[in-house]
């Protein structure tokens, strides 16, 4: 005879496990059943009463088969400078990515927690490193032979036209102008981009320059206190 | 060690002014970039501002016009000075290097009449 399926409460063989979708409740010394993803144990199991689970209130979650008690918070919502990815259901959190131009500076589990606006090169500097989803651009100062007339996100800073008779020299921030003779260029003209995975920064907000000389560096400071806890909030 | 205290944070009413300070030891303001970061009650973390190393500064849409960020390099401080302040401007507000590594305490600014 097959052997007969236990139906939920009941004892588990000694040193066996509960199956699949199951818990092992301490406290009535049972094998019971786990609520599903978008619900929660409203009441749990007895040694004659399975646990009697409820669906998750507005702005609350359950990703995974679980016995908790109570569903868990979405994150707060999306800033201004955020995308939602994800929105909050039931069944999953509410996830949100930096918007187009920004990058993300500080991670969580899934998402961003906080973006920053990608940092613009001023004429006279250039991209050195490009900005990813995660990283600010870096700018450099365009060497000697080299100029960017742009304040860019993605412009590098590329060579000066080469002329027969130099009308204007070239400098950091200005091509060279030439006589009326046709100039012959080291790179085809035009702004030369980096490929990057996140787009230009918008006009969302605007530098406020000052003068600047030296090589943008990134900030590599060592670990140190966490940041501070996210903020939780409904809808 | 690194180390980023902020102060300056208080009660302010509508309107007022407020001027928070961010000591950074342990690290150099002429080749590090700070920001300021603001957690309303109850929000997510917002970004407000940064100035680079090369003191090139940004602002978010939010807070252009009212608040400036500016540095002492002597000091080695960095600073947000924040005027015609509203209710919304209400948190607590972090400075942090610009890689995120390492946070100040916090303080806390309300405004409200």
């Known amino acids: 005879l097959p052997a007969q399926v236990a139906f939920t409460p009941y004892a588990p063989e000694p040193g066996s496990t509960c199956r699949l979708r199951e818990y092992y409740d301490q406290t009535a010394q049972m094998c019971c059943s786990k609520c599903s993803p978008g619900q929660h144990a409203k009441v749990f199991c007895t040694k004659t009463s399975d646990t009697v689970c409820d669906s998750c209130e507005d702005s609350t979650y359950t990703q995974l088969w679980n016995w908790v008690p109570e569903c868990l918070s979405c994150g707060s919502r999306c800033s201004s400078d955020q995308v939602e990815t994800q929105a909050c259901t039931r069944e999953q959190n509410r996830i949100c990515t930096c918007r187009p131009g920004w990058y993300c500076a500080l991670s969580k589990q899934e998402g961003c927690r906080l973006c920053a606006p990608l940092r613009k090169c001023r004429p006279g500097f250039g991209v050195a490193r490009p900005g990813t989803e995660t990283s600010d651009v870096v700018c450099k100062p365009c060497a000697p032979g080299t100029f960017s007339n742009t304040t860019s996100s993605t412009d590098i800073c590329r060579p000066h036209q080469i002329c027969n008779v130099v009308a204007i020299p070239g400098n950091a921030s200005m091509d060279a102008v030439c006589t009326s003779t046709s100039p012959t260029r080291s790179m085809a003209p035009g702004a030369v981009h980096l490929p990057q995975p996140v787009s230009t920064r918008s006009q969302h907000t605007q530098p406020t320059p000052e003068p600047s000389t030296a090589p943008s560096t990134s900030f590599l400071l060592p670990m140190g206190p966490s940041p501070p806890a996210e903020g939780s909030t409904g809808d | 060690e690194v180390q980023l205290v902020e102060s300056g944070g208080g009660l302010v009413q509508p309107g007022g002014s407020l001027r928070l300070s961010c000591a950074v030891s342990?690290?150099?303001?002429?080749?590090?970039?700070i920001i300021w970061v603001r957690q309303a009650p109850g929000k997510g973390l917002e970004w407000v501002s940064t100035?680079?190393?090369?003191?090139?500064?940004y602002y978010a849409d939010s807070v252009k016009g009212r608040f400036t960020i500016s540095r002492d390099l002597a000091k080695n401080t960095v600073y947000l000075q924040m005027n015609s302040l509203r209710a919304e401007d209400t948190a607590v507000y972090y400075c942090?290097?610009?890689?995120?590594?390492?946070w100040g305490q916090g303080t806390q600014v309300t405004v409200s009449s």
């Open positions: 942090a290097g610009s890689a995120f590594d390492f």
């Open positions: 342990g690290a150099s303001l002429s080749r590090n970039a």
């Open positions: 100035i680079y190393d090369d003191g090139e500064t």
